[in-house]
Each structure stands twice: as C-alpha cells, then as structure tokens.
C-alpha cells in the first residue's frame, strides 16, 4: 500500500503546477513553481 | 564567459547600514534569480534570499526579512544587497551566485565574495 | 525548512585513498514525476567560492573529475572520491534545491 505522505507530497521549485496548495514554497506562478515573493 | 562580479570588502560600525553589488555578464542578465548565500568565518553556507532581476521578485529566507533588502538595476545588470542594523552576527563573507536554470537552483555561477566585517 | 546534515565533520585520508561523506536530508527530495533527488554537493577550497560538482544527486557538473560520484535517492545521499589528491583538500557541502536552497553543515577533508 502507498504510504499516505506519498499521495499528498508536494511538488519543488520549477515543478509544473495549477494551484499554490500543490506546491512546497505555495507559490505557483506561471504553472510554475516559484518562491514565494515578498511583499514590498 | 559568465562572470559575477562583487564589490570590495566592507568595515563597518554596529547600527550601520552596508550595501554591496555584484555585476553580472555574459548570460541573460533578467532570465535568472540571482541568490545570495552567507558565511560566517569558519562556519558554512546559508541562503539569504533571491531576486529575479527580470521584474525585481524578492523571496527571503524568515530570519533575513528586514535585515536584507535585495535590488537590481537591469541597465547595468548589476544587484545588490543591503544589510541594515548591523550586529557582529552580520560579520562574514556574502557570495552572490545563480543557478543552472531559471528554476534549477544548483548554483553553478559564484561571485568571488564580500567580506563584511562589523566592529566598533 | 529542509534541514540538511552531513557527517563526519571532518575526516583525514592519505593520497589515493578512497573517501566517503554523507548527507542526510529532513525530508524526501525525490520528485516522483520525474524521479529526481533535488540535491547538489560542492567543493570549496581554503580561501575560495564555492564550486558545483554534483547535482540532480548523480550528474557530474561538466569539468569535474570523474572521482568524484554522487550517489542516493530520498533521504540518504553520498559523496565518493575515489582516489584523493591532495588538490581535493576542501570542505564539501551538499546542498536541496526542492523547496527554498539550504545546505548541510560541511565536511572538512584533510590530507594526511
């Protein structure tokens, strides 16, 4: 059986994404996934 | 020949504030992050932050928001880093370096560093 | 963060021994989509930047010498040379790249 965490591991930076939640920084930009970006 | 290039070293005074530059050339200036990293004498590396000159996006690592503010200025492919507030824990060698990709962030670019000391 | 640690913090080989660091990563940097570790070592010798050797865990940065092979998947990652030279006296740090870059606190390689 897969491991839980398996399922819901989130993806790097550069990854291709279509939601901030899929992503480890919680940043997709661009269906990219970036750094998170400061607000200035 | 891609090349970074850092400012010089830097004596300053706790309280103060610095500002350092590294010079970019020979790649596609705005198409990277460009990524600062610390070290402390002695000790090893730790990431800063990055900007990504081409629409100036700053990420920081937490505990350097406030303490570093990252710049670029495309016309002369050039950013830099200002450390305010300066403490003796500011005291080390900052590298500026990129990665192999826009989004690959192995840092294959380095600049030659600069030394910061912080005394009285 | 991605907590990154290395051991030994240093070791001391004779020339043309085999030589062995390894790093341990707080979580999985294998990326399932297309199976690979985010992972990077470097050499930096006394009084010098840091040099990229290794990246995407196993890859060879173009220049290094084939010594010089990474290995591991997820968790557990290893620097091998395979025949030290005294040239090779540095400290080596890996490095993830799968979320904000963070880096293992070194091993000082020292040449008897």
């Known amino acids: 059986m897969t491991p839980f965490w398996r399922g819901v591991s989130l993806r790097p930076i550069g990854a291709s994404c279509r939601d901030d939640s899929e992503c480890i920084t919680r940043l997709c930009r661009k269906r990219r996934c970036s750094l998170s970006v400061a607000q200035e | 020949e891609v090349q970074l290039q850092q400012s010089g070293t830097v004596l300053a005074r706790p309280g103060a504030s610095v500002k350092m530059s590294c010079k970019a050339s020979g790649y596609t200036f705005t198409s990277y992050w460009m990524h600062w990293v610390k070290q402390r004498p002695g000790q090893g590396l730790e990431w800063i932050g990055a900007?990504?000159?081409?629409?100036?996006?700053?990420s920081y690592k937490q505990k350097f928001k406030g303490k570093a503010k990252l710049t670029a200025v495309t016309s002369a492919s050039t950013v830099y880093m200002e450390l305010s507030s300066l403490t003796d824990e500011d005291s080390a060698v900052y590298y500026c370096?990129?990665?192999?990709?826009?989004?690959?962030?192995?840092?294959?670019?380095w600049g030659q560093g600069t030394s910061v000391t912080v005394s009285s | 963060d991605i907590v990154m640690s290395q051991s030994p913090s240093s070791l001391a080989v004779s020339v043309g021994e085999k030589v062995t660091m390894s790093c341990k990563s707080s979580?999985?940097?294998?990326?399932?989509?297309?199976?690979?570790?985010?992972l990077a070592w470097y050499q930096q010798k006394p009084g010098q930047s840091p040099k990229l050797l290794i990246y995407?865990?196993?890859t060879r940065e173009s220049g290094v010498p084939d010594r010089f092979t990474g290995s591991g998947s997820g968790t557990d990652f290893t620097l091998t040379i395979s025949s030290v030279k005294a040239e090779d006296l540095a400290v080596y740090y890996c490095?993830?790249?799968?979320?904000?870059?963070?880096f293992g606190g070194g091993t000082k390689l020292k040449i008897k």
């Open positions: 995407w865990a196993s």
């Open positions: 900007i990504y000159p081409g629409n100036s996006d700053t």
């Open positions: 979580q999985s940097l294998l990326y399932s989509s297309n199976q690979k570790n985010y």
């Open positions: 370096t990129y990665g192999k990709e826009e989004y690959l962030f192995a840092m294959d670019y």
């Open positions: 490095q993830q790249y799968y979320s904000y870059p963070t």
